[in-house]
Amino acid sequence: QRGPLPKPSLQALPSSLVPLEKPVTLRCQGPPGVDLYRLEKLSSSRYQDQAVLFIPAMKRHLAGRYRCSYQNGSLWSPPSDQLELVATGVFAKPSLSAQPGPAVSSGGDVTLQCQTRYGFDQFALYKEGDPAPYKNPERWYRASFPIITVTAAHSGTYRCYSFSSGDPYLWSAPSDPLELMVTEFSEATTELTVSLTNKVFTTETSRSITASPKEPGSPAGPARQHYTK
């Protein structure tokens, strides 16, 4: 007797964060020789019996949670992990700043602050090259992402998004990129050097940063939460 069927994987290419009107492909991958795939959008009656969902142009109503499974003979696999497909560019971009500044010496502390003029209660911070954001629910239209005991690994390009807990898959456009520079000098310059270039956002390599809440009134517990559960 064969063992239980392994669950398939579900991925979004090139990314699960999809600007409105841009293409994305959801691909369900099971073992070789699968008889039938089923890919479904949760909290809706939408499903299709194939492994690939091609979206030529992202729309608001396509954002949400997806999962897939497959059938071999009469057996259905367990469902894949849920994939959360997010439409970005739905709202105006927030601003991202570093306190006390974007140049910080190794071992020091820095706080990245995401701010919006609108009443969003959720924020997500991305480091270029990391696969998942660091989410932080806050009030007062801003969120703080403290980085304690900075190391050279924290250098890089950061962006943040804002969104509402009532519509968790409809996000703002990304903030302009902020370049965090970690130096080995004893004194960090506080000169603001925010890069406004449109840098490429890739999700190929995985590095981790530690973010913990510092702002009064922020919820207890870690601010870092992997978006894909």
Epitope: K22, F54, P56
Partner: antibody, heavy 119, light 107 residues
Framework: VTLKESGPGILQPSQTLSLTCSFS??????????VGWIRQPSGKGLEWLAH???????YYNTALKSRLTISKDTSNNQVFLKIASVDTADTATYYC????????????WGQGTTLTVSS | DIQMTQSPASLSASVGETVTITCRAS??????LAWYQQKQGKSPHLLVY???NLADGVPSRFSGSGSGTQFSLKINSLQPEDFGSYYC?????????FGGGTKLEIK
């Protein structure tokens, strides 16, 4: 897979251009398949005009959108493009091409049909 | 709209040489890029899709590379039938736009 464009050849300014793309070897009811229109003035580069997907979603060149209409007849394997109020700047060779979502490319092209707009 | 900047606009080379044509996108288009070859009086012909994949029947002397904003088409050991015009095109959201083209001529 083959595609073939047909059109009037010559039009006067302000007339409406009607183009037909007749194809074989694939179906526009197949998931992930589309047909697009591209034009090329003599000696110049290529310009994407419009395309239509298997599910009838349509997309247009921003600058020309108000003048363009794309449609399809799936059962007869045809795609149509209308361009309203043509001008001499619309003189070009018009191509239709198949689009396949895998790789997102124009993987098969027709031979082209030439339009001259002249008074 | 995404702009595609192709260079050089024209290029003279000899049979047997290796040439590279580049295409730069004004923003990240991931790998949503295709390359086409067009000979005088003929329709364009797909060479490379998804930035790096050779289309069916395309000789292996052609290769595509790049992702994000920088792309290139390399032709090793040029053959007489390779001379003509080459175009890149992005597919990352409409309007799909083409590069201005590169005319490859025999030296």
């Amino acid at each position: 897979v083959t595609l073939k464009e047909s059109g009037p050849g010559i039009l006067q300014p302000s007339q409406t251009l009607s183009l037909t793309c007749s194809f074989s070897g694939f179906s526009l009811s197949t998931y992930g398949i589309g047909v697009g229109w591209i034009r090329q003035p003599s000696g110049k580069g290529l310009e994407w005009l419009a395309h239509i997907w298997w599910d009838d979603n349509k997309y247009y060149n921003t600058a020309l959108k108000s003048r363009l209409t794309i449609s399809k007849d799936t059962s007869n394997n045809q795609v149509f493009l209308k361009i309203a109020s043509v001008d001499t700047a619309d003189t070009a060779t018009y191509y239709c091409a198949r689009i396949h979502y895998y790789g997102s490319s124009l993987d098969y092209w027709g031979q082209g049909t030439t339009l001259t707009v002249s008074s | 709209d995404i702009q595609m900047t192709q260079s050089p606009a024209s290029l003279s080379a000899s049979v047997g040489e290796t040439v590279t044509i580049t295409c730069r996108a004004s923003e990240n288009i991931y790998s949503y890029l295709a390359w086409y070859q067009q000979k005088q009086g003929k329709s364009p012909h797909l060479l490379v899709y998804a930035a790096t994949n050779l289309a069916d029947g395309v000789p292996s002397r052609f290769s595509g590379s790049g992702s994000g904003t920088q792309f290139s088409l390399k032709i090793n050991s040029l053959q007489p039938e390779d001379f003509g015009s080459y175009y890149c095109q992005h597919f990352y959201g409409t309007p799909w736009t083409f590069g201005g083209g590169t005319k490859l001529e025999i030296k």
